[in-house]
Interface confidence: low
Amino acid sequence: CVICDPSVVLALKSLEKDYLPGHLDAKHHKAMMERVENAVKDFQELSLNEDAYMGVVDEATLQKGSWSLLKDLKRITDSDVKGDLFVKELFWMLHLQKETFATYVARFQKEAYCPNKCGVMLQTLIWCKNCKKEVHACRKSYDCGERNVEVPQMEDMILDCELNWHQASEGLTDYSFYRVWGNNTETLVSKGKEATLTKPMVGPEDAGSYRCELGSVNSSPATIINFHVTVLPKMIKEEKPSPNIVTPGEATTESSISLQPLQPEKMLASR
């Protein structure tokens, strides 16, 4: 797959034109470069310890693999080694770089390939067989579950629709937040690039169901998250009556504070 990186192709050309003359008998140049190119192309035939190799990588994995290869190729050419020793060293290096690339690919397949647990993620991948870049849709269940949110009355409600893979996904459009009513109707509350919906100083009327939808270029939503918002009763200060007996030196102006929820009828009256 590293052959898909133009800098690797350039480095191999430079090896042929700039390094081989003066370091290897001219009659071996053609056969040598064929072997080198085959060895580099052979990077696509990987045997991974646990997973089957899928034959695709992302840009970051390709860059990592090619940078590692180029670094070691430079070490060899900088050493000015010649003849059989050069050939031997070069092919050892290519073998070990293939091993290294296999570890990068294994990590990519485990951690970075379709990392979304739900929704649809669009990921640009490089197909090693033909070096083509294509956008791959990682399709999981659209529904990314439900979140229960509790907000004390008069505080800010924040509904966060962002999932860790959203930043890495391509083709995402807008976050839309809907207020969902009991009779299967809904109202669009906000739409835009902001992944959170913030409602300052919530009241009891803000309790209920909300839905977030993240749109994507291929029309189907990338993510759907449902929120169930509970507005907790406001905590108020209430003065306790002072005790009848006042001991000498005791302050009478201070009262102890207890936190009590609003009575239901008071809550209704506040609407």
């Epitope: 070691d72 070490r75 020793l85 031997k88 060293e89």
Partner: nanobody
Amino acid sequence: QVQLVESGGGLVQPGGSLRLSCAASGFTFSNDAMTWVRQAPGKALEWVSSITLLGGGIPYYSDTVKGRFTISRDNTKNMLYLQMNSLKPEDTAVYYCAKGFKSDYPRGQGTQVTVSS
């Protein structure tokens, strides 16, 4: 014929260090890459580190040991070394040195490394 004799293994506590040695004979040591591989009980053979020839040898390490192990060679003495620092229980295995860079090349009898408290 090729002879490789490993030594330096033993029992060590987690976080400790060991230095493995491999005495090579029966081939031109300075003309070959050398490799350390290991095999934990019931597990497959695992590549640990290789060293090539140039400039005293270019080292390569597996991700599991990178930053903790150091491979080196002394061509004048036909010796290969593996300095193992910050050892972990999962480093427990029989360690073999091998001629060349593949784990299926000729290798020695191995030396047991046990990391345990």
